[in-house]
């Protein structure tokens, strides 16, 4: 299977006597590493002996030893990929075929590479684009089919024997695909380069000449022209005559047509190299040139500026810019056709001469409303004075001035009133077209510049308006000073800071957030009964009977406002304890008797203790003590004790009498 070995290398390598050759080479032997390598020169297979005849340039044996005399030829490869070779120096008789005889564990192979060694350094080759046109960048390429690490070379560009200023980019390739040295020069040829000789010179590392290639530049270009005029300064007065002549200094290819242009436009029936202008008028002033064409395109001469002199024409005024904004800068320009240019100007504002203004331009750095009006001017040169033209109008625009917000209502304003405001101003240019109000609200604008606030809020403090044309001018805000009844009235406990216990000193405060007017009165009430007229309500020693629902009222001249009802809760130890008995305090034995510990306490009793007539505590802790069946021995006095978080209370003694049943009496 001959596909086992794959080689890549340039097919032919080029060099010259005394240089060197570097042969980039890769291979792949799929069945293992290289075991031996022999480099033949012009190998010939002898089928009789089954051997190769030819010079052995290099030989590496299976044990890896290389004869020491093999200095000139070097195998730079390895056992599995690289088969690169170097011959340094290379000789003329090295030309021919190189045979790489390689052997792996399972196969042998012969790969052939061509070597072309010349007696002297061969010339590089200059490559030019198919067509070169003036001012179009082209790339000149100089290619040499040679590169070797051991023999540095350089390629130099010359134009007419002089080194070219442009920087050339030199690249070398020493790859399995190609071996070359290339120099590329980017160059924008001018028409003057046409016919010039370009040389690419091959030099050694020391700059010594080795060989070269030359080409003659064929630069296609438009015709190059010179124009001559009589009189030479091209300045005449109306009625004079002028002659212009066009001369072709170079054209590649040959020119085909000629024409004349004035201010870029072709002159009809003028197709010769001479242009005669008789009895010129001022309209013939302008820039003249001749145009000659070839296959590349038209070439134009330099322009001749023909000046036909005349006195100034009626002037016009140009304003930069109108309308003008107050405070901005404005420039007035006096425009009058004249040759030579005017040397003096006279300016007018609303028909009156503006003193000291003699320039072509008038500059006003800060425009004010009184600057508005009509501006005109007169121009003057050495041939005479022009006429004053119609002039131009300056319009000065400014924001509305002296804007005020006016309250139309009688004062004072009360919460809930309907308030009407108007927005007034002194003057405006352009006219006021809209108004703005601050703050924004869902308010009515019944007419332009009028604001109606229905049901005015207590917190509507200030209102400002703006009158607007192209700009908005804001008035100073006006205070509505809305009066209203006291707001956010509430009862606040000042002391004690914690829960209220019976006997504590207690203070309640009547608070409110705001009132206008500020003067207020206070009222305290409990269950509809008036308690006081101060901002505070004080209890020196609170009792459970003081508990209940309290409200306070605050009033001013506008109205009065009540707080939400506030509940005063007094905590006290159990009191008024008593033991009640059911069905009564006399019960027949065997029946059921229930003793209940009744009390008044805040918070309610959480724990009960029962005691008998000997003050012995009983093992019962609920509010009811149930005796069932009741016995005669249960007769006696009982009392109870109640406990809550505040303290304890005890009842007086209550006596239970248990009498014998008829059965018991009958048995006795």
């Amino acid at each position: 299977d001959s596909s086992k070995w794959v080689f890549e290398h340039p097919e032919t390598l080029y060099a010259w006597e005394g240089a060197c050759v570097w042969i980039p080479c890769t291979y792949r032997a799929l069945d293992g590493d290289l075991e031996s390598f022999i480099l033949f020169h012009n190998p010939e297979y002898n089928k009789n002996t089954s051997k190769f005849d030819g010079t052995r340039l290099y030989e590496s044996t299976k044990d890896g030893k290389v004869p020491s005399e093999q200095k000139r030829v070097q195998f730079l490869g390895d056992k599995n990929k690289n088969c690169t070779l170097s011959i340094h120096p290379v000789h003329l008789n090295d030309s021919g075929q190189l045979g790489l005889r390689m052997e792996s564990k399972t196969e042998k192979w012969m790969e052939r590479i061509h070597l072309n060694v010349s007696e002297r350094p061969f010339p590089p080759h200059i490559q030019l684009p198919p067509e070169i046109q003036e001012s179009q960048e082209v790339t000149l390429t100089c290619l040499l089919n040679f590169s070797c690490y051991g023999y540095p070379i350089q390629l130099q560009w010359l134009l007419e024997g002089v080194p070219m200023r442009q920087a050339a980019v030199t690249s070398t390739s020493l790859t399995i695909k190609s071996v070359f040295t290339r120099s590329e020069l980017k160059f924008s040829p001018q028409w003057s380069h046409h016919g010039k000789i370009v040389t690419c010179q091959l030099q050694d590392a020391d700059g010594k000449f080795l060989s070269n290639d030359t080409v003659q530049l064929n630069v296609k270009h438009t015709p190059k022209l010179e124009i001559k005029v009589t009189p030479s300064d091209a300045i005449v007065r109306e009625g004079d005559s002028v002659t212009m002549t066009c001369e072709v200094s170079s054209s590649n290819p040959e020119y085909t047509t000629v024409s004349w242009l004035k201010d870029g436009t072709s002159l009809k029936k003028q197709n010769t190299f001479t242009l005669n202008l008789r009895e010129v008028t001022k309209d013939q002033s302008g820039k003249y040139c001749c145009q000659v064409s070839n296959d590349v395109g038209p070439g134009r001469s330099e322009e001749v500026f023909l000046q036909v002199q005349y006195a100034p024409e009626p002037s016009t005024v140009q304003i930069l810019h109108s309308p003008a904004v107050e405070g901005s800068q404005v420039e007035f320009l006096c425009m009058s056709l004249a040759n030579p240019l005017p040397t003096n100007y006279t300016w007018y504002h609303n028909g009156k001469e503006m003193q000291g203004r003699t320039e072509e331009k008038v500059h006003i750095p800060k425009i004010l409303p009184w600057h508005a009006g009509t501006y005109s001017c007169v121009a003057e040169n050495i041939l005479g004075t022009g006429q004053r033209g119609p002039g131009a109008e300056l319009d000065v625009q400014y924001p509305p001035k002296k804007v005020t917000t006016v309250i139309q209502n009688p004062m004072p304003i009360r919460e809930g009133d309907t308030v009407t405001l108007s927005c007034n101003y002194n003057s405006s240019n352009p006219s006021v077209t809209r108004y703005e109000w601050k703050p924004h609200g869902a308010w009515e604008e019944p007419s332009l510049g009028v604001l109606k606030i229905q049901n005015v809020g207590w917190d509507n403090t200030t209102i400002a308006c703006a009158a607007c044309n192209s700009w908005c001018s804001w008035a100073s805000p006006v205070a509505l000073n809305v009066q209203y009844a006291p707001r956010d009235v509430r009862v606040r406990k000042i002391k004690p800071l914690s829960e209220i216990h019976s006997g504590n000193s207690v203070s309640l405060q009547c608070d409110f957030s705001s009132s206008h007017p500020k003067e207020v009165q206070f009222f305290w009430e409990k269950n509809g009964r008036l308690l006081g007229k101060e901002s505070q309500l004080n209890f020196d020693s609170i009792s459970p009977e003081d508990a209940g629902s309290y409200s306070c009222w605050v009033n001013n001249s506008i109205g009065q406002t009540a707080s939400k009802a506030w509940t005063l809760e007094v905590l006290y130890a159990p009191r008024r304890l008593r033991v009640s008995m059911s069905p009564g305090d006399q019960v027949m034995e065997g029946k059921s008797a229930t003793l209940t510990c009744e009390s008044d306490a805040n918070p309610p009793v959480s724990h009960y203790t029962w005691f008998d007539w000997n003050n012995q505590s009983l093992p019962y802790h609920s509010q009811k003590l149930r005796l069932e069946p009741v016995k005669v021995q249960h007769s006696g006095a009982y009392w109870c004790q109640g406990t809550n978080s505040v303290g304890k209370g005890r009842s007086p003694l209550s006596t239970l009498t248990v009498y014998y049943s008829p059965e018991t009496i009958g048995r006795r």
Epitope: S2, E103, K108
Partner: nanobody, 128 residues
Framework: QVQLVESGGGVVRPGDSLRLSCTVS????????MGWFRQAPGKEREVVSC????????YYADSVKGRFTISRDNAKNTVYLQMNSLKPEDTAIYYC?????????????????????WGQGTQVTVSS
């Protein structure tokens, strides 16, 4: 170590036949080429015939074409050379050789270059 043992040589009259055998041992390749060479007194060793182990492609020197036949028995690792119509100029020591295949670019040589392993040789003499 590769060993080749030739046998079948001898003295015969012109026009007679002989069959040479060569058995190879110690050779591990699946694909190889075996060949017969001969060296007459005072002359260079020359190729007689070669055969490849895999496809049986054969090669004959011009001087033996039509008279000699090379064959192989892969199972026995043996190559044979059947020599008919022998001539006095066929007198020589006949050597057996074995080697890996050889390619020159894409071209395949049936008789490889520089055989690595050789037998001791067997004498063939053709005389009236």
């Amino acid at each position: 170590q590769v060993q080749l043992v030739e046998s079948g040589g001898g003295v015969v009259r012109p026009g007679d036949s002989l069959r040479l055998s060569c058995t190879v041992s110690g050779f591990t390749l699946d694909y190889y080429v075996m060949g017969w060479f001969r060296q007459a007194p005072g002359k260079e060793r020359e190729v007689v015939s070669c055969i490849s182990s895999s496809d049986g492609v054969t090669y004959y020197a011009d001087s033996v074409k039509g008279r000699f036949t090379i064959s192989r028995d892969n199972a026995k690792n043996t190559v044979y050379l059947q020599m008919n119509s022998l001539k006095p100029e066929d007198t020589a020591i006949y050597y057996c050789a074995v080697d890996k295949p050889f390619y020159d670019g894409g071209y395949y040589y049936t008789c490889p270059v520089d055989f690595d392993s050789w037998g001791q040789g067997t004498q063939v003499t053709v005389s009236s």
